[in-house]
């Protein structure tokens, strides 16, 4: 029950993040203009990842896509990498955690290729919320960047007579919304590589030591040699040839029909 | 076919508080802001404040602690009120609707005249 | 506040001159966002109030004849009459539309001959 809560509580919460990294991406406002020294403007720019917008204070806002590929920053276009990167990943790992849910029955899958799905999905949930947070601390660290130096630059002008006021950026409310959605996607993994371990059907461990009978007739588990991934519980992903005991601190799984020799 | 058209008291004692209604036909108050400028006789014009169409407003700074605009969309009228007035505040009133921060349509003005 | 210099203050010409007058501002009108210029230019004829002759410091307004022609950017602008006509007898006058609040320039006055 706690693992279906679990699986299932971190599959909605990887849902909302990913949801917000991709309105995030979408946004305009991942760069607002600096009102600090201009705060009487009737016109107000703020930039996103795809376009740059002016609203007017007549309420009328005018946005212009950046058409260009290659004239646009590398730092801009590694964002872009990293947000489109971390949106195909997440989506992805919504898909395959949509077959993994224990609440969902599909055909006769068995539990431990539904524990394998949690946990490629958790790890598809936290590589997307990495590179989502990733992409919104490189682009916050340029704006850092870009607004020292333009306020190293603030009045420039003719003889130091005429006042030119840079236009400086300051962090946009897509970033903040980047960044929350990228914890909560990364979070919705763990959660997600958690309910894995409590999914894997194992062996069954008794108090003490089992013993399995030795012999010519060598027991397989069902399955034995299955594709994994590498990470988790290593139980399920070998022959057991056991001719031996087994400790007891083995995770504790109940036991299946196939335990016993 | 767009207008505006001030009407005022025109006539006001030194310290008393002026009140003027623009009263426009043909665009909606909803979707366009309405500037206040003035002119005193033989000066240039002066601008005094403007509401937008949310109904926030920006006033000219020397005349912020005195001025005051507002509106009645379902009316169509927009309100200028300006306190403790003096001589110098004699000038032409206009209203004039805004495009994209220009004025694109101007009312023909009340005169006001601040004497006693 | 930002303040709009006129240059010259009074100007007395024959018709089918060409006409230029400037305005200058403390501070610059281009906004880095959309590359616009946020300068006004209005015409006053006598008894009348102001009417909008260009905006966005180039663009003409609709029905304005293309004798007017406005220019510039950042903080110098121009205003041109190419030929002038006796209907042209105003006052000009530049606003700045980019910061509040709105200030007008102090006024061309043009005078035929």
């Known amino acids: 029950m706690a693992v279906t809560a679990c699986q299932g509580l971190g599959f909605v919460v990887s849902l909302i993040g990913i949801a917000g990294i991709i309105a995030a991406t979408c946004m305009d406002q991942w760069s607002t203009q600096d009102l600090y020294n201009n705060p009487v403007t009737a016109v107000f720019n703020y930039q996103g990842l795809w376009r740059s917008c002016v609203r007017e204070s007549s309420g009328f806002t005018e946005c212009r896509g950046y058409f260009t590929l290659l004239g646009l920053p590398a730092m801009l276009q590694a964002v872009r990498a990293l947000m489109i990167v971390g949106i195909v990943l997440g989506a992805i790992g919504l898909l395959v955690s949509i077959f993994a849910l224990k609440c969902i029955r599909i055909g006769s899958m068995e539990d431990s290729a539904k524990a394998n799905m949690t946990l490629t999905s958790g790890i598809m949930f936290i590589v997307s919320g990495l590179c989502a947070i990733a992409g919104v601390s490189v682009f916050a660290n340029m704006l850092v960047t870009n607004f020292w130096m333009s306020t190293a630059n603030m009045y420039t002008g003719m003889g130091g007579m005429v006042q030119t006021v840079q236009t400086r950026y300051t962090f946009g409310a897509a970033l903040f919304v980047g960044w929350v959605a990228g914890g909560l996607t990364l979070i919705g993994g763990v959660m997600m590589c958690i309910a894995c371990r409590g999914l894997a059907p194992e062996e069954t461990n008794y108090k003490a030591v089992s013993y399995h009978a030795s012999g010519h007739s060598v027991a397989y588990k069902p399955g034995g040699f299955k594709a994994s991934t590498g990470f988790g519980s290593n139980t399920k992903n070998k022959k057991i040839y056991d001719g031996g005991a087994r400790t007891e601190d083995e995770v504790q799984s109940y036991p299946s029909k196939h335990d016993y020799v | 076919q767009v207008q505006l058209k001030e009407s005022g008291p025109g006539l006001v004692a030194p310290s008393q508080s002026l009140s003027i209604t623009c009263t426009v036909s043909g665009f909606s108050l909803t979707s366009y802001g309405v500037h206040w400028v003035r002119q005193p006789p033989g000066k240039g014009l002066e601008w005094l404040g403007v509401?937008?169409?949310?109904?926030?407003?920006n006033y000219e700074s020397a005349l912020m602690s005195r001025l005051s605009i507002s509106k009645d969309n379902s009316k169509s009228q927009v309100f200028l009120k300006m306190n403790s007035l003096q001589t110098d505040d004699t000038a032409m009133y206009y209203c004039a609707r805004d495009r994209r921060l220009a004025m694109d349509y101007w009312g023909q003005g009340t005169s006001v005249t601040v004497s006693s | 506040d930002i303040v709009m210099t006129q240059s010259p203050s009074s100007l007395t010409v024959t018709a089918g001159e060409k006409v230029t007058m400037t305005c200058k501002s403390s501070q610059s009108l281009l906004n880095i966002g959309n590359q616009k210029n946020y300068l006004t230019w209005y015409q006053q004829k006598p008894g009348q109030p102001p009417k909008l002759l260009i905006y966005?410091?180039?663009t003409r307004e609709s029905g304005v004849p293309d004798r007017f022609t406005g220019s510039g950017s950042g903080t110098d602008f121009t205003l041109t009459i190419s030929i002038l006509q006796a209907e042209d007898l105003a006052v000009y006058y530049c606003?700045?539309?980019?910061?509040?609040?709105?200030?007008f320039g102090s006024g061309t006055k043009l005078e035929i001959k």
């Open positions: 606003q700045n539309d980019y910061s509040y609040p709105f200030t």
């Open positions: 966005w410091a180039s």
């Open positions: 509401i937008w169409p949310g109904g926030n407003t």
